[in-house]
């Protein structure tokens, strides 16, 4: 059930996954929606008692999809938009006055105004958000300074009240970046740069989509199921570098590499993975096991189960003849399978719930 | 591979599950061994730089069963005994001099010595550990005071250096408690007291074993698979009360209730669950899927896979005729299935790895 309204002075008790910092409850709701497991959240507004908790956005999960409500001044709670049918976007053009969003300040320069500062952030590969000191800022040497910032999660590590500054986010997710969009996927290629994370994926296209939606992934290397070292098969390495480009390209069979599409205007979806993977089993945390007629029905079942992230459909010879099989609904901490097996006859795939989270824009 | 030795001035990087406090590295290793997912740990000794981290025991997990080693003064790292064949016990008779183990002080009284204080803790249903102020304690009115303590986890919430006190643990796990051992399981009974946790279990005996090894569970109620409310079927409610006894007993069909066996001397195992559960599927996080010959082979496979906690064996008619089937190796955050399904034809069970963790003692 889709619940859009926010509950003021209400705290959802328990179910904590993680805490991030957001400038307001609305942005917290979007962060929750894009998080692989978040179904509910509580945001601590400035009116809350403990100032050390201001702007904290507590992401929550619950097997029952609900949590006990507790009265708490300044708490704002609500549900993710995962349960909602409408198209979504991570694009956030808002400018936040008198807020300093904290992160790693890796670049400081003078700009005319906040808009120019936001453009600079949008056109810098590493920038997640910025803080701009206006011309009224008390300390003269900091006036008109545009600080570009990044963090390991893409979200501020903290937010504090600070007079005469404004803050905002990169508009890459609004498809407004002028950075180069590189769509090539390079076969027999390994990029030898910093791994920031690794996930399991069935193919290089899924790996690229995961890289695109990871806050710090600029390029990737994917090891196919034929890769010699078993523990690396179907492994998607998410990578970055200081320059934003891979420093070294190594020729290796059964590996493919490519770039994040975060700077691209997409004519194709980059968030949802709609293909079926044949003779492939996705392993993960089991949500349920149900009997269905065919793998499409299994994908539908997964898409309609709010906590389902991916599935495996399996049918023995005898049940196959009856047009029936078993649908294993699954999830994981990051939305990707924990392991992929081949040759067991399963048909696997992902929820289509994420398709509504793609930007609808023209090809760049 | 069983690694008993501890690595001094070594910190295992990453893989953190949770942090508890233990008086030394040896006790940290035992805590790790009994934790459902911990495979490695790092303990911060008094020689470590940051005094706020002293006595912290960081429990860790890793898919590869190893983590990168980093040099760090005062860190002591090692592996759980899960990988080891020898019999284990949680019994810890050590007395720790000049250490105050912190928790909820719920009972303070005068005792002759630390031994009498430890006996008092062992014979109190709620007591996890104690701190005793010796006759040399600076503050005269606190001398010879025995403080009984408990926490939500059973482990201290902190440990600090304090001259002229000694601390130690309850000896219930040494089978030295004189508290009543109540072995009855009451059919058609619900105990209506505080729920401290809930887990999924296939029957009341498994529920009782889980209660027995939960630090705060004194009694339990188990809802069978025939319980009318679907969401409560196979649910094991772990309970406590101030008196240590259930306050209210309600007659309800399809429910069973009983007591923790923490005060009993066992002739039967209370940690491991060796039965097979027929026509039953255990759901959880999948570790691997392998082809085996029969459900006993599946249990063996689970027992030898260090991270496996439970399994489901499944065979279609055609594979059953060949004496073969599929073995799904699984785990979860607490060692119990996340859901149990009936009527799908699977055979499920638990790892036998935990059998070596039972106390070997005579019947009380």
């Amino acid at each position: 059930e889709c619940v859009i309204k926010l509950f003021s002075d209400i705290y959802f008790q328990g179910g904590d996954i993680t805490t991030v910092y957001t400038p307001n409850a609305k942005h917290c709701q979007v962060v929750c929606t894009y998080h692989p497991r978040c179904l509910l959240f509580t945001f601590m507004a400035e009116s809350s008692v403990d100032s050390t908790k201001w702007f904290s956005c507590i992401l929550k999960d619950s097997v029952t999809e609900s949590l006990p409500k507790v009265n708490m001044t300044g708490a704002i709670s609500g549900y993710s938009f995962k349960q909602c049918p409408h198209q979504l976007s991570a694009c956030n053009k808002d400018i936040y006055v008198d807020l300093d969003m904290q992160g790693m300040n890796y670049n400081g320069s003078v700009t005319k105004n906040a808009q120019e500062c936001q453009e600079r952030c949008t056109n810098d590969a590493h920038c997640h958000f910025f803080t701009y000191a206006t011309r009224q800022f008390p300390s003269a040497e900091h006036r008109n300074i545009c600080l570009l910032k990044y963090t390991q999660t893409g979200a501020p590590t903290g937010i504090r009240k600070l007079k005469k500054v404004v803050s905002g986010f990169s508009l890459k997710s609004c498809a407004l970046s002028n950075l180069a969009c590189i769509r090539d996927i390079f076969p027999s290629t390994v990029f030898a740069d910093n791994n920031i994370d690794s996930v399991v994926a069935p193919d290089a296209l899924v790996c690229r989509r995961i890289c695109t939606h990871h806050p710090n992934c600029l390029f990737f290397t994917f090891f196919s199921q034929e890769w010699p070292k078993e523990s690396h098969r179907n492994l998607c390495l998410l990578k970055t570098s200081e320059s934003g480009l891979p420093s070294t390209r190594i020729h290796k069979n059964q590996a493919l590499s490519g770039f994040s599409l975060q700077n691209c205007r997409h004519s194709i979806p980059v968030f949802c993975h709609s293909s079926f993977y044949y003779d492939t089993d996705f392993l993960g945390e089991e949500l349920d096991i149900v009997d269905v007629k065919g793998h499409e029905a299994c994908q539908k079942m997964c898409t309609s189960a709010i906590r389902c992230q991916f599935f495996t459909y399996s049918s023995s010879q005898e049940s196959h003849n009856k047009g029936k099989g078993t649908c294993y609904l699954k999830l994981s901490s990051n939305g990707s399978p924990t392991k992929i097996l081949h040759g067991r006859g399963g048909i696997s795939g992902y929820t289509l719930r994420l398709c509504k989270m793609d930007n609808v824009c023209t090809t760049k | 591979e069983c690694v008993i030795k501890l690595f001094s001035d070594i910190y295992f990087q990453g893989g953190d599950i949770t942090t508890v406090y233990t008086p030394n590295a040896k006790h940290c290793q035992v805590v790790c061994t009994y934790h459902p997912r911990c495979l490695l740990f790092t303990f911060m000794a008094e020689s470590s730089v940051d005094s706020t981290k002293w006595f912290s025991c960081i429990l860790k997990d890793s898919v590869t069963e190893s983590l990168p080693k980093v040099n760090m003064t005062g860190a002591i790292s090692g592996y759980s005994f899960k990988q080891c064949p020898h019999q284990l016990s949680a019994c810890n008779k050590d007395i720790y001099v000049d250490l105050d183990m912190q928790g909820m002080n719920y009972n303070g009284s005068v005792t002759k010595n630390a031994q009498e204080c430890q006996e008092r803790c062992t014979n109190d249903a709620h007591c996890h550990f104690f701190t005793y102020a010796t006759r040399q304690f600076p503050s005269a009115e606190h001398r010879n005071i025995c403080l009984l303590k408990y926490t939500q986890t059973g482990a201290p919430t902190g440990i600090r250096k304090l001259k002229k006190v000694v601390s130690g643990f309850s000896l219930k796990s040494c089978a030295l408690s004189n508290l009543a051992c109540i072995r009855d399981i009451f059919p058609s009974t619900v105990f209506a007291d505080n729920n401290i946790d809930s887990v999924v279990a296939p029957d009341a005996l498994v529920c009782r074993r889980i209660c027995t090894h939960h630090p705060n569970c004194l009694f339990f109620t188990f809802f069978s698979q025939e319980w009318p409310k679907e969401s409560h079927r196979n649910l094991c409610l772990l309970k406590t009360s101030e008196s240590g006894l259930p306050s209210t007993r309600i007659h309800k069909n399809q429910a069973l209730s009983g007591f923790s066996l923490q005060n009993c001397r066992h002739s039967i195992p209370v940690f491991c669950h060796s039965s097979f559960y027929y026509d039953t599927d255990f759901l959880g996080e999948e570790l691997d899927i392998v082809d085996v010959k029969g459900h006993e082979a599946c249990q063996k496979m689970c027992t030898s896979a260090i991270r496996c906690q439970f399994f489901t064996y499944s065979s279609s008619q055609e594979s059953h005729n060949k004496g073969k089937g599929t073995c799904y190796l699984k785990l979860s955050s607490n060692g119990s299935p996340t859901k149990i399904l009936h009527g799908r034809g699977g055979i499920s069970g638990y790892t036998l790895r935990l059998c070596k963790m039972d106390n070997v003692c005579t019947t009380k």
Epitope: - | L179, I182, S243, L245, P246, R249
Partner: nanobody, 124 residues
Framework: QVQLVESGGGSVQAGGSLRLSCAAS????????VGWFRQAPGKEREGVAA????????YYADSVKGRFTISQDNSKNTVYLQMNSLRAEDTAVYYC?????????????????WGQGTLVTVSS
């Protein structure tokens, strides 16, 4: 006002039997431990037998195992101690006690409510 009242004491020859009763008012035996204790002149009070009324788990001192039986009648809120094969060393004042927490069943220090006692004399 909690009251435990013992009855059934008296004099008996060695090898004989007695049945002690303990009736409670203001306190329900249901879901609680009830114990029988005894104190001989010049000796410390010791646990004889105890029962946990929910389900009727019973506990006995080694010295009386096989000779004494503790039982309950929840409808009458009464606990009994059937004493067979009595010996001279069983001579003592017998007390009934009620606990309100999970206790070591034969440890008198942990029982909250006590009766006045009834004297049992066994002559050889």
């Amino acid at each position: 006002q909690v009251q435990l009242v013992e009855s059934g004491g008296g004099s008996v020859q060695a090898g004989g039997s007695l049945r002690l009763s303990c009736a409670a008012s203001g306190y329900t035996f249901n879901n609680n431990f009830v114990g029988w204790f005894r104190q001989a002149p010049g000796k410390e009070r010791e646990g004889v037998a105890a029962i946990y009324s929910l389900g009727g788990s019973t506990y006995y001192a080694d010295s009386v195992k096989g000779r004494f039986t503790i039982s309950q009648d929840n409808s009458k809120n009464t606990v009994y101690l059937q004493m067979n094969s009595l010996r001279a060393e069983d001579t003592a004042v017998y007390y009934c006690a009620g606990a309100i927490t999970w206790v070591p069943p034969l440890s008198h220090r942990r029982y909250t409510y006590w009766g006045q006692g009834t004297l049992v004399t066994v002559s050889s």
